[in-house]
């Protein structure tokens, strides 16, 4: 051993996912999502587990409600730290309508293009977070099939907050969001009681996303 050898304290990285994936997170930003910082906390906890970079995992975020906004593209940031800073700054765009089919279709057609950073041969993953039945659900079946045709793996998360606040039945909503998830549904669909509970699914969601690279 060299005489200059010394022990240096090292910190184990938070990242658990050092795989190559192109992940687009599709966020419902309509008014009924409350409080919004529960969503940004969820994003933070999920993203800090990822090893983000041009040769590792890339993340893009799309927000929808009445219309769709690309918050940032897959190739916008080249490190986990940069993505965490950007995700924290995402503001809720509001709106009363929940155009989920439009959000998913825009992510498929636009966010997953090479122009926005998608890489050929890299597995595509979409994470959809919403709290209400879509106002364009007549389009949902075709939109999901289009994603399926393009081999986009879909994880869907149903937030039951607005239903519980209004003492409304969640049955129809849960069925719709389950229909968005890839098969097997039980591994791709999550539901949480309210927005505050989003952080409780991060570990499991992260593990299931990262497991995709092994399949």
């Amino acid at each position: 051993v060299s005489p200059t050898f010394q022990v240096v304290n090292s910190i184990a990285p938070v990242q658990e996912c050092s795989t190559q994936l192109d992940i687009v997170i599709v966020l419902d930003g309509s008014n009924s999502i409350y409080p919004w910082d529960s969503v940004t906390a969820f994003l933070n906890d999920l993203l800090e587990r990822m090893d983000i970079g041009p040769k590792q995992t890339q993340v893009g975020i799309v927000q929808y409600g009445e219309n769709v906004t690309h918050e940032f593209n897959l190739n916008k940031y080249s490190s986990t730290e940069e993505v965490l800073v950007a995700a924290k700054k995402i503001v809720q765009r509001g709106g009363r309508q929940t155009m989920t089919a439009l959000g998913i279709d825009t992510a498929r057609k636009e966010a997953f293009t090479e122009a926005r950073g998608a890489r050929r041969g890299v597995k595509k993953v979409m994470v959809i977070v919403t709290d209400g039945e879509s106002h364009d659900n007549h389009r949902l079946k075709k939109v999901i099939q289009d994603c399926e045709d393009e081999n986009i793996q879909r994880f869907s998360i149903a937030i039951l907050g607005s239903y519980n606040r209004g003492n409304l039945s969640t049955e129809k909503f849960v069925e719709e969001i389950k229909s968005i998830a890839s098969e097997p549904t039980e591994k791709h669909f999550f539901n949480v009681s309210d927005e505050l509970a989003l952080v409780t699914i991060v570990k499991t969601l992260g593990e299931r996303i990262f497991a995709l690279e092994a399949t």
């Epitope: 008014n31 409350y34 009445e66 809720q92 009363r96 607005s162 606040r165 209004g166 409304l168 505050l196």
Partner: antibody
Framework: EVQLVQSGAEVKKPGESLRISCKGS????????IGWVRQMPGKGLEWMGI????????RYSPSFQGQVTISADKSISTAYLQWSSLKASDTAMYYC??????????????????WGQGTLVTVS | EIVLTQSPGTLSLSPGERATLSCRAS???????LAWYQQKPAQAPRLLIY???RRATGIPDRFSGSGSGTDFTLTISRLEPEDFAVYYC?????????FGQGTTVEIK
């Protein structure tokens, strides 16, 4: 930068009509509810009602139902509070505020994150 | 409707001291949907805390909120000169917004 800018102070006589305004900027004004809050001289805050400028859906506090009218013109990102016949007891500071939350179906919830500077209405 | 009662009505303290403001609801506030606002003379209210304990953007960490159900507290750990003002609590869990009557924090 999110801003709510209210119209200037008004001095009116009892029985007169009045409309005050609140113009939003720096965010998608048609996508957030706007509330109105009254503060009588030396007193606390009272919620009056709320409107969604995107489609003018409106809810009123029972205490103010029938006493005032809340409206909006989404083309100019402005919400209004109006009286058809003012009373001396309407003398107060009136604030508009943006709701971070929702008011769909039977449930309303959320906090007011941005406020206008206030419009003082004096009726005497 | 839910009635909010704030206490004390007035709190006389010196800069650097700790301020504890109480807000009690006549019935349980659902999902801890309670906010705190600060209002200075001739100014609009300013959001401090929402969902009982979450600090609004730009609010210093000397302000903290706690509580659930019917009892809520706003704490200012060390009073700064600019903190002397009126503080209102507000509930929003019942399709209506109601405010407490306010607590005045004044310089001793």
């Amino acid at each position: 930068e999110v801003q709510l800018v209210q119209s200037g102070a008004e001095v009116k006589k009892p029985g007169e009509s009045l409309r005050i305004s609140c113009k939003g900027s720096g965010y998608s004004v048609t996508s957030y509810w706007i509330g109105w809050v009254r503060q009588m001289p030396g007193k606390g805050l009272e919620w009056m009602g709320i409107i969604y400028p995107g489609d003018s859906d409106t809810r009123y506090s029972p205490s103010f139902q029938g006493q005032v009218t809340i409206s909006a013109d989404k083309s100019i990102s402005t919400a209004y509070l109006q009286w058809s016949s003012l009373k001396a007891s309407d003398t107060a500071m009136y604030y508009c505020a943006r709701l971070q939350g929702d008011c769909s179906g039977g449930t309303c919830y959320g906090h007011f994150d941005y406020w206008g500077q206030g419009t003082l209405v004096t009726v005497s | 409707e839910i009635v909010l009662t704030q206490s004390p009505g007035t709190l006389s303290l010196s800069p650097g001291e700790r301020a504890t403001l109480s807000c009690r609801a006549s019935q349980s506030v659902s999902s801890s949907y309670l906010a705190w606002y600060q209002q200075k003379p001739a100014q609009a209210p300013r959001l401090l805390i929402y969902v009982a304990s979450r600090r609004a953007t730009g609010i210093p960490d000397r302000f903290s909120g706690s509580g659930s159900g019917t009892d809520f507290t706003l704490t200012i750990s060390r009073l700064e000169p600019e903190d002397f003002a009126v503080y209102y609590c507000q509930q929003y869990g019942t399709s209506s917004w109601t405010f407490g009557q306010g607590t005045t924090v004044e310089i001793k």
